[in-house]
């Protein structure tokens, strides 16, 4: 792993002036395990709008690794296994919450951040603009 | 509206025994804005594996509202607009972080939680099991 030196200017967790802060318990509770065991799926390969997964790593963020989907084709895969450009592969995006170390390299102070990630791809009928 | 009384057992933000806690600045920074303007799409309707969006609300969680995708069909929509059961509509799932008030109703203490959400659907070739 990457060793991150502690920033000597890290705020004191008891500092009353540290802006708009709260205590967050990082002992993560995973709500998925009981009801919906996450199977490693190969949908990215079997989809008619297949995608590649790119690793986005940032040691100053939690989670530090986020996998980003990039659609493989502009079109979609047809029954013959060829790319059909009459259809479009498009990314499905979602906004997620992450924690960013702030100031950088501080082990116990973070800022909430919203980021937009592409989770996978879907095949859509294109919008055709007719020119008058 | 529901009146939520403050829980008298809320932990003190200076409590040294509050397990594995960090300081988090709740003034959310939005990283999307600089690079990636959000464009509203109707992919959920135009997809060959269309989905409906269901609202999941929990006032003790942030984000309080999460939209869950449910695929409309078992199969996928073909070029004629009919459902083709030789293909499968499947949900694309993502694990996301949320903050949960803990203990409940405490305004300044939270616990990180991971939940699995369905973001949209994609059309995949089914896995066919041949019986010997």
């Amino acid at each position: 792993g990457i060793t991150i030196p502690r920033n000597p200017g890290c705020p004191n967790s008891e500092d009353k002036n540290f802006p708009r802060t709260v205590m967050v318990n990082l002992n993560i509770h995973n709500r998925n395990t009981n009801t919906n065991p996450k199977r490693s799926s190969d949908y990215y390969n079997r989809s008619t709008s297949p995608w590649n997964l790119h690793r986005n790593e940032d040691p100053e963020r939690y989670p530090s690794v986020i996998w980003e989907a990039k659609c493989r084709h502009l079109g979609c895969i047809n029954a013959d296994g060829n790319v059909d450009y009459h259809m479009n592969s498009v990314p499905i995006q979602q906004e997620i919450l992450v924690l960013r170390r702030e100031p950088p390299h501080c082990p116990n102070s973070f800022r909430l951040e919203k980021i937009l990630v592409s989770v996978g791809c879907t095949c859509v009928t294109p919008i055709v603009h007719h020119v008058a | 509206g529901i009146t939520i009384p403050r829980n008298p057992g809320c932990p003190n933000s200076e409590d040294k025994n509050f397990p594995r806690t960090v300081m988090v600045n709740l003034n959310i920074h939005n990283r999307n804005t600089n690079t990636n303007p959000k464009r509203s799409s109707d992919y959920y309707n135009r997809s060959t594996s269309p989905w409906n969006l269901h609202r999941n609300e929990d006032p003790e969680r942030y984000p309080s509202v999460i939209w869950e995708a449910k695929c409309r069909h078992l199969g996928c929509i073909n070029a004629d607009g009919n459902v083709d059961y030789h293909m499968n509509s499947v949900p694309i799932q993502q694990e996301i972080l949320v903050l949960r008030r803990e203990p409940p109703h405490c305004p300044n203490s939270f616990r990180l939680e991971k939940i699995l959400v369905s973001v949209g659907c994609t059309c995949v070739t089914p896995i066919v099991h041949h019986v010997a």
């Epitope: 709260v22 997620i96 | 804005t33 464009r39 003790e60 984000p63 309080s64 949209g120």
Partner: antibody, heavy 126, light 107 residues
Framework: EVQLVQSGAEVKKPGESVKISCKAS????????ISWVRQAPGQGLEWMGG????????DYAQKFQGRVTITADESTTTAYMELSGLTSDDTAVYYC???????????????????WGQGTTVTVSS | EIVLTQSPDFQSVTPKEKVTITCRAS??????LHWYQQKPDQSPKLLIK???HSISGVPSRFSGSGSGTDFTLTINSLEAEDAGTYYC?????????FGQGTKVDIK
Amino acid sequence: EVQLVQSGAEVKKPGESVKISCKASGGSFSSYGISWVRQAPGQGLEWMGGITVFFGTADYAQKFQGRVTITADESTTTAYMELSGLTSDDTAVYYCARVPNEFWNGYYATQDFDYWGQGTTVTVSS
Amino acid sequence: EIVLTQSPDFQSVTPKEKVTITCRASQDIGSELHWYQQKPDQSPKLLIKYASHSISGVPSRFSGSGSGTDFTLTINSLEAEDAGTYYCHQSYWLPNTFGQGTKVDIK
């Protein structure tokens, strides 16, 4: 049904402060944000700031920074906007509006103002 | 901050006519543009969210389009009750900003 009910009209002298309340009913108060928008006589709408109720954190327009404080009390499902150092330019109707505060899901993330209070008239005059 | 410029400032229209109001943003705001109607002595009312999404209870004659910097609110077949001032609003950048408003009155 969602309703936002604001406190009554106020008459203030220059230099004083005003605190307006906005009582929400219907829906889960903590799931939303509350924004405050004002409208001077015969003028358009001006956003002053807003609060994420769940966290109690507020953002303010630069123009009002230092003069405005927005708070929310979950136990009474009420939001407040306090404006200090009033001048005659602050004579306006003040509205609270609900912001659903949902995360982007590719379709939309509702940051619109879906319900509004009836407005509170503030008159600043010596 | 993002500046929203509406045009026209004023429109006098005959019932059943089609009304088009445009809103131009000073920079790309994706789809984060909303439209409101305000009648005299009333609070604003949400008509369209996210550029083109209709709101439950709002008549279908109101529609919106656009993305990026150029947006349009269309009222198909105007009715007398549609008189009022229409505002666009962006929620993409803080501070939230509004257009200056377009007043629509009935001939």
